[in-house]
Interface confidence: medium
């Protein structure tokens, strides 16, 4: 059972999303040519498991990450501390925005990533997104991702 | 998945020099990124250094700038760590990982090697 404080958050970003769009602060050197849908997963105490597969340079690479919950709703830490995840829900129904700052190969970095049920692209979705990053001073160009059900290497 | 096998650990006084390794089981290593990591008793897993796949940028936490270099052989698909003037508080267990996507580093110690140990006496 979820504490009562984050059970809600947690229940209500569970299960399949699709990563439709990517921005940060600085330039990230490779876009994903594409990216399977992120499972979300609830754990027990309120913690998430993110899972993803990203296609990159023709290897497919696992992704799997703890966001350990907080006392405060919405708000989660991942790989050792070291980042620090907002997930709030974007203006867009079935559309969510994770938000996260921390340490990247020794760099301080943010990053935001928008979230939708669905893979088709919502326009609004992406312009309420543009708007949040600009308002976060994340200058970079915004990423928008090809779906993929599943990952092959070498080709897509 | 990549095997990864890091070798070149031991003792050594305070003031001296290691050189580990840490080859990759692979054919596309050139395209990776690659880094080193460690982890001391009681401590968390901790970045020490990576080199990007192109370009050759290297990003070293501000602990072991100055006196670790981080370097790689893709025709032997193997990456190096040169410790120079080592401390007593280097002293852990060093790992190596490769990874696709520059944004997303080694998460997790279920795919990562045994990792080699170092320790620095004074």
């Known amino acids: 059972q979820d504490t009562p404080a984050l059970g809600k958050d947690t229940v209500a970003v569970s299960g399949k999303w699709y990563l439709k769009a990517m921005t940060a602060d600085q330039e990230v050197p490779e876009k994903p040519d594409s990216v399977t849908p992120m499972i979300l997963k609830a754990q027990k105490g309120g913690n998430l498991e993110a899972k993803i597969t990203m296609l990159t340079n023709g290897q497919c690479q696992n992704i799997t990450v703890v966001l350990h919950k907080t006392s405060e709703p919405g708000k989660y830490t991942a790989y050792e501390g070291q980042r620090v995840v907002f997930i709030q829900p974007s203006p867009v129904r079935d559309h969510y925005i994770l938000y996260c700052e921390g340490e990247l190969h020794g760099r301080q970095i943010r990053m935001a990533k928008l979230l939708g049920r669905d893979p088709e692209q919502s326009q609004e979705a992406l312009e309420d997104f543009r708007e949040f990053s600009r308002a976060k001073g994340l200058n970079q160009e915004i990423l928008e991702l090809a779906q993929s059900e599943t990952c092959s290497p070498g080709g897509q | 998945q990549v095997k990864l096998e890091e070798s070149g650990g031991g003792l050594v006084q305070a003031g001296g020099s290691l050189r580990l390794s840490c080859v990759a089981s692979?054919?596309?290593?050139?395209?990776?990124?690659t880094g080193w990591y460690r982890q001391a008793p009681g401590r968390e897993r901790e970045f020490v250094a990576t080199?990007?796949?192109?370009?050759?940028?290297?990003y070293y936490a501000d602990s072991v700038k100055g006196r670790f270099t981080i370097s790689r052989d893709n025709a032997k698909n193997t990456v190096y760590l040169q410790m120079n003037s080592l401390k007593p508080e280097d002293t852990a267990v060093y790992y190596c990982?490769?990874?696709?996507?520059?944004?997303?580093?080694?998460?997790?110690?279920?795919?990562w090697g045994q990792g080699t140990q170092v320790t620095v006496s004074s």
């Open positions: 990982n490769v990874w696709a996507n520059w944004g997303a580093p080694p998460s997790d110690f279920s795919s």
């Open positions: 080199l990007r796949a192109s370009g050759g940028d290297t």
């Open positions: 692979g054919r596309t290593f050139s395209r990776w990124h």
